[in-house]
Interface confidence: medium
C-alpha cells in the first residue's frame, strides 16, 4: 500500500524538515531559514515560533521542530506550549488586577504563582492551632485538646480569645 | 502576522510628560486586553498597567497610580499610555503587550509582545 501511495503521491516521500515543492514539479525542497516540517509529506513549512518580549528561548527552531519559549525571571508559562507568561508574585501574595498584593488576614499563599487561600481551620478535625498561620504558611493542626492528656506532650497548646488559625467568615 | 508596534519614547526632564503608542495589527484588537509593561536598566520587567477590551476597566501598578493614563482607541486598533510628572525611576524600555480575551484569569498573562520604545527621564 505504501509503494502505491508513494507512486500517486510523490510528496509522501518528503521527509520531516522539508516540503513538496509544486512550483519545482513536486520535488522536495528544504524547509526555508525560520521555519520548519515536523512530519513528512507537507507542502508548506510552518513559521518558526519567535520569542520575544517578555518569552525567552527554550529550545532554537530547526528544520524538523519549532521553538519552544519559557518565560523571562519574574513571570511563570501559561498555557499550552507557553503561549502566555504571567507575572511571578512573592510568597504571601497573590495577582490581582491591580499587580501583586498581600494575602488578606487568614490566608496565606506560599508560591509565587496562585491565589491566596484560607487557613486550615483546624477546630472542625477537633485539633489545636499548633503553629499559627502566615501570610506565606498555612497553620500547623495539632492534637486534639482531648488527647493532651498532663505529660502527654511537651507542647503546650496556645488558648487565644479568637482561634488564630480560624480564618473570618 | 499578529504585531505590537511601539512608538512615543524619547528624552525627557523630570516632571515632563510623554504619551507612548502601540499599533495593533494582525488580530482582533477590540477582543483583547492590553498591557504596558516596563523593563528598567538591569532590572527585570514590571507590569505596568492594563485595560479592559471595551475600554471600561484599567489597573495600574501603585508606583505610576496617578500618573499614568491607558487608553485605547478600538478604531484605530491601538492603546496608549499617558505618562506625566515622569520620575528618573521611570526609565526604562516600555513594551506593549496583548492580554487575554474574555473575562478570566488568562487577561494577567501576556502573549504578543512589540519590540518597545525607550524612555528616558534625566535631568
Known amino acids: 500500500f505504501e509503494r502505491t501511495r508513494s507512486l500517486q503521491d510523490p510528496c509522501s516521500n518528503c521527509p520531516a524538515g522539508t516540503f513538496c515543492d509544486n512550483n519545482r514539479n513536486q520535488i522536495c525542497s528544504p524547509c526555508p531559514p525560520n521555519s520548519f516540517s515536523s512530519a513528512g509529506g507537507q507542502r508548506t513549512c510552518d513559521i518558526c515560533r519567535q520569542c520575544k518580549g517578555v518569552f525567552r528561548t527554550r529550545k532554537e527552531c530547526s528544520s524538523t521542530s519549532n521553538a519552544e519559549c519559557d518565560c523571562t525571571p519574574g513571570f511563570h508559562c501559561l498555557g499550552a506550549g507557553c503561549s502566555m507568561c504571567e507575572q511571578d508574585c512573592k510568597q504571601g501574595q497573590e495577582l490581582t488586577k491591580k499587580g501583586c498584593k498581600d494575602c488578606c488576614f487568614g490566608t496565606f499563599n506560599d508560591q509565587k504563582r496562585g491565589i491566596c487561600r484560607p487557613w486550615t481551620n483546624c477546630s472542625l478535625d477537633g485539633k489545636s492551632v499548633l503553629v499559627n498561620g502566615t501570610k506565606e504558611r498555612d497553620v500547623v493542626c495539632g492534637p486534639s485538646p482531648a488527647d493532651l492528656s498532663p505529660g502527654a506532650s511537651s507542647v503546650t497548646p496556645p488558648a487565644p480569645a479568637r482561634e488564630p488559625g480560624h480564618s473570618p467568615q | 502576522e499578529v504585531q505590537l508596534v511601539e512608538s512615543g519614547g524619547g528624552l525627557v526632564q523630570p516632571g515632563g510628560s510623554l504619551r507612548l503608542s502601540c499599533a495593533a495589527s494582525g488580530f482582533t484588537f477590540s477582543d483583547y486586553w492590553m498591557n504596558w509593561a516596563r523593563q528598567a536598566p538591569g532590572k527585570g520587567l514590571e507590569w505596568v498597567a492594563n485595560i479592559k477590551e471595551d475600554g471600561s476597566e484599567k489597573y495600574y501598578v501603585d508606583s505610576v497610580e496617578g500618573r499614568f493614563t491607558i487608553s485605547r482607541d478600538n478604531a484605530k486598533n491601538s492603546t496608549y499610555l499617558q505618562m506625566n510628572s515622569l520620575r528618573v525611576e521611570d526609565t526604562a524600555v516600555y513594551y506593549c503587550?496583548?492580554?487575554?480575551?474574555?473575562?478570566?484569569?488568562?487577561?494577567?498573562?501576556?502573549?504578543?509582545w512589540g519590540q518597545g520604545t525607550t524612555v528616558t527621564v534625566s535631568s
Open positions: 503587550a496583548r492580554g487575554g480575551a474574555g473575562y478570566s484569569m488568562s487577561h494577567y498573562g501576556m502573549d504578543v
